[in-house]
């Protein structure tokens, strides 16, 4: 039994890191393999992650971690019984994929303005809380070409757009994702989408 693709890990910069790897043949990850991990820290202890299958030869492990700080470094040991298959390390702050924003809501009762709000996925004491920026994706269910992205580069988790920038009388969906420039993170997954019917009063034509 050998590792074909070494484990690569990403952290949510809070409490979970996800490691994926591939073996050289079909493997029952949960019965045959164990990923041991330990924070390099005086008061830490070793933990064991039981991997799940991720395709025939692929394995994935979800590592429960202490609250992350930038200096953290974890040792990783992949075992098959008594055989050490791979040894490595992982710095969560260098491989961050933020959590997805939540609670996306479209407020349509503010005159002819659409107000989209969502929740920051981090608690205020987490470093990423004040460093996330967002992308909001709005698309029409009726017209695949009507697809737009709004970049929200300020910290407030909200976006205002004029209802008239979208077509009236049809349904739209929106979703939002996050990233943090400070740690050069990847984008988060998209939030669950929310749907609304866009309608607004057409302005009277002037003759």
């Amino acid at each position: 039994m050998k590792v074909l693709q070494e484990p690569t890990c990403v952290s949510d910069y809070m409490s979970i890191s996800t490691c994926e790897w591939k073996m050289n043949g079909p493997t029952n990850c949960s019965t045959e393999l164990r990923l041991l991990y330990q924070l390099v820290f005086l008061l830490s202890e070793a933990h064991t992650c039981i991997p799940e299958n991720n395709g025939g030869a692929g394995c994935v492990c979800h590592l429960l971690m202490d609250d992350v700080v930038s200096a953290d470094n974890y040792t990783l040991d992949l075992w098959a019984g008594q055989q050490l298959l791979w040894k490595g390390s992982f710095k969560p702050s260098e491989h961050v994929k933020p959590r997805a924003p939540g609670n996306l809501t479209v407020h349509t009762n503010v005159s002819d303005t659409l107000l989209l709000t969502w929740s920051n996925p981090y608690p205020p004491d987490n470093y990423l809380y004040n460093h996330l920026t967002y992308a909001v994706n709005i698309w029409s269910e009726n017209d695949p070409a009507d697809f737009r992205i709004y970049n929200v580069t300020y910290l407030e988790p909200s976006l205002r757009i004029a209802a008239s920038t979208l077509k009236s009388g049809i349904s739209y969906r929106a979703r939002v994702r996050a990233w943090a420039q400070c740690y050069n993170t990847t984008w988060s997954e998209w939030s669950p989408s929310t749907k609304w019917h866009n309608s607004y009063r057409e302005p009277f034509e002037q003759h």
């Epitope: 409490s15 390099v40 820290f41 005086l42 008061l43 830490s44 202890e45 971690m65 202490d66 609250d67 700080v69 930038s70 200096a71 953290d72 608690p123 004491d125």
Partner: antibody
Framework: EVQLVESGGGLVHPGGSLRLSCAAS????????MFWVRQAPGKGLEWVSG???????SYADSVKGRFTISRDNAKNSLYLQMNSLRAEDTAVYYC?????????WGQGTLVTVSS | EIVLTQSPGTLSLSPGERATLSCRAS???????LAWYQQKPGQAPRLLIF???SRAPGIPDRFSGSGSGTDFTLTISRLEPEDFAVYYC??????????FGQGTKVEIK
Amino acid sequence: EVQLVESGGGLVHPGGSLRLSCAASGFTFSRNAMFWVRQAPGKGLEWVSGIGTGGATSYADSVKGRFTISRDNAKNSLYLQMNSLRAEDTAVYYCARGRYYFPWWGQGTLVTVSS
Amino acid sequence: EIVLTQSPGTLSLSPGERATLSCRASQSVSSSYLAWYQQKPGQAPRLLIFGASSRAPGIPDRFSGSGSGTDFTLTISRLEPEDFAVYYCQQYDHSAGWTFGQGTKVEIK
């Protein structure tokens, strides 16, 4: 908002015992190492003890064998049991959250050891 | 045990002046594990700098940290009235644990 509130300080005779408590709120206590740091009157800061998320502990040489740190994750509380107290243990005792350094501190509780 | 020695013991300066505080370690310290704190009378310490040079959230940019190995520096570019306090450096070591310097008092001249 992160809050750490110490209690249990007071006047104790040399050789006596005292138990300090720290009530934590505003963060996930179970995922954080916790510490006690003290400061004698007019002196500098001295790290006393720390406890990891899994219960691993460490002590300064000056308190080893006399002090015991513990935590109760269900109650979001940190404790310091201090036995065989000496005059030189007189200090303000701070509860702190952190790891390699300490971003969050309580306001401290004063322990006075005197006959 | 790693010993941190801060100098000077007291720094007498006027508002608007630049303050340079030194912290010297008895053996090499990882920059990742070097921090600076500010403490005012009757208050708990406040983290200013971690990782030798990263400002903690909410700390004004007049505070900066630098250094590596055994020599570290905290600089306050222009002293404000609220900056007069005692400053401590602190290190962490995987085997020796946590130690603080003895402090530098920055007082009004």
